[in-house]
Interface confidence: medium
């Protein structure tokens, strides 16, 4: 009956319009489909033009939904990465705060003439944190070799102390242990508890970096075409009720997205690996524990040179031979009390155990997120048929959706009846991302282990590597020359959508 | 004895950048930081920048500061100070200084001075 | 910045103290004199009171909180010139140097 078919154009008449899209392209009534590309060819409300339209507008529509589901996962993981970096970096920055309130009075000039020492100690540690290129453990090694010499100084200034004695007390030093065990526990767990930290933190901007990079790949003509089919050929066929096929949905979306969920397994082994980490944030060698108390090993170590002084004196002569006198300098420094110590074990504030169980119940609920993501955008964006089998839109008209729902990831998608894929070209930036997955997730699963893995750059667009020692002012400049025998690689990214707020390295 | 020898002072253009090189002997040039002071003509002493021994930590004084990059080479015990854009007010004589200790940028610690060099902005 | 009195005078013999004020508090001091202008300064006193080898006696260093005394015991005619401190500030950690004070002995 051709007025009832001439009637249905004013429902498309309707939905075009209100895309935006010019009406005087729409016919008043249905005309034969032979030019149709994309739709079958049947009579249809549809001109060429209106075809290429909506299939513009389709394709639009799926990638904004795509960047949407996107954008919540990212938020969540930047929202992640910034409530644990402020979390560590506040640790580190109570600690030094705490040194800089307490230590003045507890061990007087042996601080306020080494201030530097430790304030660039806290830089080192904050650069470490942050992925910088540093060997937490020669920087170790060279902060206590050069405070001990300062130290050394300042407690016998009636010697006369030239370079080579001061080489042969740092030769000496290793088995005098001057220190005590300070520097040896510091070592072992700071190592251990920065690398957590940073690791867990780092895992959260490579996962946010991998969703950003992958949500800007642009879907193919082949993707384009099938859901035109899928969601306005129904409209240009006369039955604009219809509503897609669940099944129907499901085959098209998972051929679009085959490269995406080839991302399933090392997403699901990277957010294990990060889950798994947190472990490592609990107990005497746990993040808190240690990267909140590094002032008390620094006073431990303080004290403990004091208390060894007559000792050390006396090994250290034995070792290197009498020191001339110095005729200019006073008497040997008195010895001082010793410095009260905070105790070592922070009481957890509780902060950290409500941040690590939100962070491993969001990761556990976005493991199959790619996976997941045909079945989502079919049932929240594409407004899915709920009616029985034979009444939904299966791509050429309306009725039963007889075809298997394809597996997830491109091999599966060699039969796919909906979307032409060709299964011997994977899409590269998605490949480039599934390596990023594998290199974060070896890193985090050797962070578990407790060794300093060499951070390399993990970004294919890096941004300028970490730095910052809280300068209170710009007098300060980031030094990268490192006279250290270590040749490690910056880290380019090493917290992604972090802004650098604490000056540079050096002042 | 400790040597200080500084050289590429001279007269310069105002706008165009100046690179002074410190010489140091007599001494283990990697322990130590190492310090550029200056003086204008009837002026006091001024803080120019400073290194740490190892090279990863400088401090430059507010005059200079985004202008000037101070840097060390332990192989050939020299400390370079380049600065950029030129001023008249940069005009005066600079010093290299050694410190005592091997952190910046304490004016507090230092124990030797060169002899300077001057230099002179003017168009 | 440090503050210092811009001149003192003394008599040969006497004893001259010259102050160096506004630093911080627990940070150190040193001393340097110059005999003339251009000619290189000489450091008389490092972090307080550690005095140069080929630096006579008569000069010594005292801190009380945040100011530095360089007191000159039995003052000579040689001993005429400009003494500066330094010291640091103790938020950026860059040198800081006070104004300089004239030293002319009568």
């Known amino acids: 009956d051709p007025a009832s078919k001439s009637r249905s154009c004013g429902e498309v008449r309707q939905i075009y319009g209100a895309k935006g899209f010019s009406l005087s392209d729409v016919p008043q009534a249905e005309i034969s489909g032979e030019h149709l590309r994309i739709c079958p060819q049947g009579y249809t409300c549809c001109t060429s033009e209106m075809e290429e339209n909506l299939a513009n507008r389709s394709h639009a529509e799926l990638e904004t939904a795509l960047r949407d589901s996107s954008r919540v996962l990212q938020a969540m993981l930047a929202t992640q990465l910034r409530s644990f970096d402020d979390h560590f970096q506040h640790l580190l920055n109570d600690s030094e705060r705490t040194l800089q309130a307490t230590f003045p009075g507890a061990f007087g000039e042996l601080y306020t003439q080494n201030a530097r020492a430790f304030r660039d100690l806290y830089s080192e540690l904050r650069l470490y944190y942050r992925g910088a290129n540093l060997h937490l453990e020669e920087t170790l090694a060279e902060f206590w070799a050069r405070l001990l010499e300062r130290l050394f100084k300042q407690l016998h200034p009636q010697l006369l102390l030239p370079d080579d004695y001061l080489d042969c007390l740092g030769k000496q030093a290793e088995a005098l242990r001057p220190f005590g065990e300070a520097p040896r526990e510091l070592r072992l767990r700071a190592t251990r508890a920065f690398v957590a930290a940073r690791s867990f933190v780092q895992g959260l901007g490579v996962a946010s970096d991998v969703v950003r990079k992958v949500a800007q790949v642009p879907l193919g003509p082949e993707c384009s075409r099938a859901v035109m089919k899928l969601v306005y050929c129904a409209h240009c066929l006369g039955v604009p009720g219809a509503r897609p096929c669940p099944d129907y949905c499901r085959n098209v979306l998972k051929g679009c997205l085959a490269n995406q969920a080839d991302l399933d397994a090392e997403w699901r082994n990277l957010l294990d690996s990060m889950v798994l980490i947190t472990d490592k944030f609990w107990g005497t060698s746990g993040v808190e524990s240690v990267i909140g108390s590094v002032h008390t090993w620094l006073a431990e170590a303080i004290n403990a040179l004091q208390d060894n002084r007559d000792t050390l004196t006396a090994k250290v002569i034995q070792g290197c031979g009498n020191p001339k006198v110095n005729p200019q300098g006073p008497g040997p420094e008195e010895k001082r009390r010793r410095g009260k110590l905070a105790p070592r074990e922070r009481p957890p504030s509780g902060t950290l155990e409500k941040l690590v169980s939100e962070a491993k119940a969001q990761l556990r609920d976005v493991q199959d997120f790619w996976i997941s993501l045909p079945g989502t955008l079919c049932s929240e964006k594409m407004a899915l048929s709920t009616a029985s089998d034979d009444r939904c839109w299966n791509g050429m008209a309306r009725g039963r959706y007889l075809p298997e729902v394809m597996g997830d990831g491109l091999a599966n998608q060699i039969n796919n009846p909906e979307v032409e894929v060709d299964i011997t070209k994977p899409d590269m930036t998605i490949r480039q991302q599934i390596m990023q997955l594998k290199i974060m997730t070896n890193r985090l699963r050797s962070a578990y282990n407790g060794n300093d893995v060499d951070f390399q750059d993990a970004s294919d667009d890096g941004s300028g590597s970490g730095s910052g020692d809280g300068c209170l002012d710009d007098l300060c400049s980031r030094k990268v020359s490192r006279k250290s025998s270590s040749s490690r690689t910056p880290l380019t990214h090493a917290l992604p959508g972090l802004s650098e707020q604490e000056g540079q390295k050096t002042s | 004895a400790v040597t200080l020898d500084e050289s590429g002072g001279g007269l310069q253009t105002p706008g165009r950048a100046l690179s002074l090189v410190c010489k140091a002997s007599g001494f283990t040039f990697s322990r130590y930081a190492m310090y550029w002071v200056r003086q204008a003509p009837g002026k006091g002493l001024e803080f120019v920048a400073g290194?740490?021994?190892?090279?990863?930590?400088?401090g430059y004084g507010s005059a200079v500061k985004g202008r000037a990059t101070i840097s060390r080479d332990s192989g050939q015990s020299t400390v370079r100070l380049q600065l950029n854009n030129l001023r008249a007010e940069d005009t005066g004589n600079y010093y290299c200084?050694?410190?005592?200790?091997?952190?910046?940028?304490?004016?507090?610690?230092?124990?030797?001075w060169g002899h300077g060099t001057e230099v002179i902005v003017s168009s | 910045a440090s503050t210092q009195p811009s001149s003192v005078s003394a008599n040969p013999g006497e004893t001259v103290k010259i102050t160096c004020s506004g630093g911080?508090?627990?940070?150190?001091y040193g001393w340097y004199q110059q005999k003339s202008p251009g000619s290189a300064p000489v450091t008389l006193l490092y972090s307080n009171n550690n005095r140069p080898s080929d630096i006579p006696s008569r000069f010594s260093g005292s801190k009380s909180g945040s100011t530095a005394t360089l007191t000159i015991t039995g003052v000579q005619a040689e001993d005429e010139a400009v003494y500066f401190c330094?010291?640091?500030?103790?938020?950026?950690?860059?040198?800081?140097f006070g104004a300089g004070t004239t030293l002319t002995v009568l």
């Open positions: 290194i740490g021994n190892t090279g990863r930590y400088t």
């Open positions: 200084a050694k410190s005592v200790s091997p952190y910046c940028c304490d004016a507090a610690d230092i124990d030797a």
């Open positions: 911080s508090s627990g940070y150190a």
């Open positions: 330094g010291s640091v500030d103790s938020s950026s950690y860059a040198g800081i």
